[in-house]
Interface confidence: low
């Protein structure tokens, strides 16, 4: 409770009557300060501490020559010591001091908890000059107080290089309990104990805590804040909150959902983005994670072929990104693909299966019986070969790629030619004379280029030296290709 009293502001000396003294001092200028007319300051007194002896700093003033008065020590007058009020109320408090007029440039500053209050604070200083002294009243007002306004406020005055400090005024803002720690949402394992924490502060203290589960109180008797609730285990989702009570009333925390971890839902929307002869790039949309992070996923692949043994290939991959390139697949084959993901509880069911196909592969064998010879005009090299026996998976033959490398002293260059699938011979122009020409041939399908045949070399002589003997690939079992010149 606070007593408020209003009284007329009458400037008065600290000690009435003349005092002996012999110190001489120049006293020519009076303190010239504005006077705010009609201002009736509100003075606050604490009834619990009437006439409390002053314990603050004092300044010893000098002696005036006029009348040879020795001035007593300066000190702030006692004022209200402790103000208790509710949040959002307005408060005003002040400190006052009477200063002999010999002193100039006196300023009063306000401090809170050891820090000066600067800037946009509502502080007003009013001056009431009289013949010998000026009464100074410094008021500080706060509109709609908050908890952050709690603290110890003092006035300071600097005079003659001395600092005069007032008694502290303690402001205590009381309100509903304020949460400093609220329960947090959690994902827990079924039938496993866990803790929830709730902490709230006043003032006023004490703050008592009640726990609420699914709208029903858990504890009959309140616990002093902070409170830890140990839940022995849950079998289904629950919502918990805590109530904080003090003399001002009740505050309820946010409700938090405690989820029970479960296996994930199966992935959905398995999509195929890219298909090659031996790989398929898939993506999927993860299912619900069952309140527990995904650990990894499993891509299951079955070959859709009446002749296959029905075995399932399993590829384990990380849960993110939701993409996987399935490799080591057969070319031109049909596959059924499903995805399953796991968390700490277990594996999800498999996604809906989708069908996908690999494309044609490249040939796996090179053309056979490659023969190379210089024709009669010696302007061309004639190349012949036999079509390779390609597997169905390699797809339809679209042509051949011929590599011919020309090497002589200081020269080496490779050229590539492409011919259609119906060809089994080709002619290439002689590029360099007195050089070796090395020929290799590969079959090409839409799936790519197959392996090149073993190299066949032929020597191209200088002009005027004729030889028609062919070079050819070796018969099966021979170690090196034959070179016939």
């Amino acid at each position: 409770a606070i007593t408020e009293a209003r009284e007329e502001a009458k400037p008065y000396p600290l000690f009435p009557g003349p005092l002996p003294g012999s110190l001489q001092t120049d006293h020519t200028s009076l303190l010239s300060l504005p006077h705010t007319s009609g201002y009736q300051p509100a003075l606050m007194f604490s009834p619990t501490q009437p006439g409390r002896p002053y314990t603050g700093n004092v300044a010893i003033p000098r002696v005036t020559s006029a009348g040879s008065k020795l001035l007593p020590p300066l000190a702030f007058k006692h004022t209200v010591g402790h103000i208790i009020l509710s949040e959002h109320k307005d408060v005003k408090f002040n400190c006052s001091i009477s200063v002999p007029n010999i002193y100039q440039d006196t300023t009063i500053s306000w401090w809170k908890d050891g820090k000066e209050l600067l800037g946009a604070h509502h502080a007003i200083t009013q001056f009431y000059p009289d013949d010998e002294v000026t009464a100074i009243i410094a008021s500080f007002s706060i509109t709609s107080v908050q908890r952050s306004d709690n603290g110890s406020y003092i006035c300071k005055m600097k005079i003659n290089n001395e600092e005069i400090v007032s008694d502290p005024i303690y402001i205590e803002v009381q309100g509903l309990p304020h949460f400093t720690k609220q329960p947090e949402s959690m994902n827990v394992t079924r039938n496993t104990a866990f803790n929830l924490t709730c902490q709230a502060v006043g003032p006023p203290e004490p703050v008592n805590i009640f726990w609420v589960q699914n709208s029903s109180r858990v504890n009959e008797q309140p616990e002093k804040s902070p409170s830890v609730l140990t839940v022995p285990g849950l079998t289904e989702m629950a919502v918990f909150s805590c109530e904080a009570h003090n003399d001002k009333g009740l505050t309820v925390s946010k409700g938090v959902q405690i989820n029970i971890k479960a296996i994930p839902s199966p992935p959905t929307e398995v999509s195929i983005h890219n298909s090659t002869a031996h790989s398929i790039l898939i993506s999927w949309v993860p299912g619900f994670d069952g309140y527990s992070p995904f650990r990894n996923c499993s891509v299951q692949v079955k070959e859709v072929d009446p002749l296959s043994n029905g075995s399932v290939m399993i590829f384990n991959t990380s849960a993110s990104p939701h993409m996987y390139q399935i490799k080591q697949l057969q070319a031109l084959a049909n596959y059924s693909i499903g995805v399953s993901c796991m968390n700490e509880i277990g594996w999800s069911a498999v996604s809906p299966w989708i069908l996908a196909s690999t494309t044609e592969g490249a040939p796996s064998v090179a053309p056979l019986n490659v023969t190379v010879f210089l024709n009669e005009s010696r302007d061309n090299v004639d190349i012949r070969w036999m079509k390779p026996l390609t597997k169905r998976q390699a797809g339809e033959l679209v042509g051949y790629r011929i590599s011919h490398v020309w090497q002589s002293a200081g020269i080496s260059k490779e050229l590539l030619e492409e011919v259609g699938q119906n060809n089994s011979r080709a002619q290439i122009s002689v590029q360099v004379h007195n050089a070796t020409c090395t020929v290799r041939i590969a079959a090409v399908t839409k799936g790519g280029v197959g392996p090149f045949s073993d190299p066949v070399k032929i020597f191209i002589p200088a002009h005027g030296w004729v030889d028609h003997a062919p070079s050819s690939t070796p018969a099966p079992g021979n170690a090196d290709p034959v070179l016939i010149i």
């Epitope: 195929i272 983005h273 890219n274 298909s275 090659t276 996908a356 494309t359 839409k446 799936g447």
Partner: antibody, heavy 125, light 112 residues
């Protein structure tokens, strides 16, 4: 001569679906991928998705995944684009455009060498 | 997604004069296969887009040789040596290197 002939303009209500067709001629339908591109009024172009009729593989721009479905009818060499749960933001001109002679929709390439004439979709109540 | 930026929204040119349209990408369009899949389209008023250039500088069949494409990495340019009336329309650059394929905002070529 390569030609892509699209179906006519559509006026549909919000929340409904639409299916636009693109009939091709002048080339082997299964040897090229087919793509769909959206052009909002006075705005730029946005790739919606692509379809490989050779191995029946689709690939979508993530912005349209789940709402767009691309299909083909190989017998008539026709591509289709269905868009569901329409809103006014879907009002635009939609083009079909031919892709590369490629076996992957995700491989880099020089797509979009031939374009349909465009189908205007208006979504309004 | 790769962002394609065409800084000029409109380009006013005189018939017979040269024109230059720029296009920047938010990341390099050089693919691991050594190719740069940067392409240019022209959309004439009231028509469908038409491909002009692919692989930065290769002209589509039937495209006049007054068109040239150049650039590498992230900066590309389409040049017209002498603008003709049939060249008017909106020019779009687009990239086919990084999935999903993305287009520039377009540059409108108009007569001064």
């Amino acid at each position: 001569e390569v030609q892509l002939q699209q179906s006519g303009p559509e006026l549909v209500k919000p929340g409904a679906s639409v299916k636009i067709s693109c009939k091709t001629s002048g080339y082997t339908f299964t040897e090229y991928t087919m793509h769909w591109v959206k052009q909002s009024h006075g705005k730029s172009l946005e790739w919606l998705g692509g379809f490989n009729p050779n191995n029946v593989i689709t690939s979508y721009n993530q912005r349209f995944q789940g709402r767009a479905t691309l299909t083909v009818d190989k017998s008539s060499s026709t591509a289709y684009m269905e868009l569901r749960s329409l809103t006014s933001d879907d009002s635009a001109v939609y083009y079909c455009t031919r892709g590369d002679l490629l076996w992957s929709l995700l491989l880099p390439g020089n797509y979009f060498d031939y374009w349909g004439q465009g189908t205007t979709l208006t979504v309004s109540s | 997604d790769v962002v394609m930026t065409q800084s000029s929204l409109t380009l006013s040119v005189t018939i017979g004069q040269p024109a230059s349209i720029s296009c920047k990408s938010s990341q390099s369009l050089l693919d691991s296969d050594g190719k740069t899949y940067l392409n240019w389209l022209l959309q004439r008023p009231g028509q469908s887009p038409k491909r002009l250039i692919y692989l930065v500088s290769k002209l589509d069949s039937g495209v006049p040789d007054r068109f040239t494409g150049s650039g590498s990495g992230t900066d590309f340019t389409l040049k017209i040596s002498r603008v003709e009336a049939e060249d008017l329309g909106v020019y779009y650059c687009w990239q086919g290197t990084h999935f999903p394929w993305t287009f520039g905002g377009g540059t409108k070529l108009e007569i001064k």
